[in-house]
Interface confidence: low
């Protein structure tokens, strides 16, 4: 089990590092997006796991971005952000609409809008229960 957890972490790390770099190979990214969306978590240990991924970086030093699957909809009151940015991209994470042609990346206008917890604990619990 420990080996399985280590292997899973390695796969997730590679997925995060390569997120959005190849529009033709998105299966791992979609799977991880789905994990974040379902478990209401972001990143492996912390949401900050995403902050140094180059494809997610904007031009400014503070331009931190995360996949839209990290977005906590219940914490967001800004309807403009929801309607124009988040919902159209999160709608692709449903069971029926899983395909996409580019990485779904959202700016972080306030980091309180993203899930604060990493996914490692939730996934490890899931592994132990199965």
């Amino acid at each position: 089990r420990a080996q399985l957890e280590r292997s899973l972490r390695d796969v997730v790390e590679k997925t995060i590092q390569k997120y959005g770099t190849n529009p033709e190979e998105t299966a791992a990214e979609e799977s991880w997006d789905y994990v974040q969306f379902q478990l209401r978590c972001c990143g492996w240990h912390y949401p900050q796991d995403w902050f140094q991924v180059l494809i997610l970086r904007g031009n400014g030093s503070e331009a931190h971005r995360v996949p839209c699957s990290c977005y906590n909809l219940s914490a967001t009151n800004d309807s403009t952000i929801l309607d124009k940015v988040i919902l159209p991209q999160l709608s692709r994470l449903g069971h029926l609409a899983r395909s996409r042609h580019s990485a779904d990346i959202c700016a972080v206008p306030a980091e309180s809008h993203i899930y604060r917890e990493g996914c490692a604990q939730g996934l490890q619990k899931w592994l132990h229960n199965n």
Partner: antibody, heavy 120, light 110 residues
Amino acid sequence: EVQLVESGGGLVQPGGSLRLSCAASGFSLSNYNMGWVRQAPGKGLEWVSVIDASGTTYYATWAKGRFTISRDNSKNTLYLQMNSLRAEDTATYYCARELLYFGSSYYDLWGQGTLVTVSS
Amino acid sequence: DVVMTQSPSTLSASVGDRVTITCQASQNIDSNLAWYQQKPGKAPKFLIYYASNLPFGVPSRFKGSGSGTEFTLTISSLQPDDFATYYCQSADVGSTYVAAFGGGTKVEIK
């Protein structure tokens, strides 16, 4: 512009106290772990303390009980309260923003530093 | 607490040289290591995180490697701007959360 600016350094007598401030601009301090790192004249870097985004504090063994890290999110400012100061605390104190990556921490943004001199 | 030992403490080199700095941890820290560059009178500048990852804007001539207890920073072709002091930092966010810096390596002009 994203930056950190320290203040509050100066000359203090042994046994005295000092409070350092670090004003953040261009980003919200409350969303980050923040830390203090010091450097004695002509010496290397020495980790002092960190306060995480939830407010939990961590200290180097030698700093426990004498130094207190805190933050005022409404002022977007980090503090380091230093008590019972000794000559060996003489150093430039840097405020730094901490990022985390897969359980690993590092400091991606640093202030210019403020010099603390402890001498009679 | 983990102790970080850097070597050499001083290194004389010329522009264009390949330079290697090593950092040894007193206990296993996996890949939880960062490197910084510091010039006199300036704040440290963040160079490498998670042992081998370059942040946005750091030139590709800088390369970090290693895991466990042995780590290396390599500058493939030293540039005039690279003469500085380099520090490694253990960065394991465990239950104790104590960070530690190496003693530094000064890269000076030969």
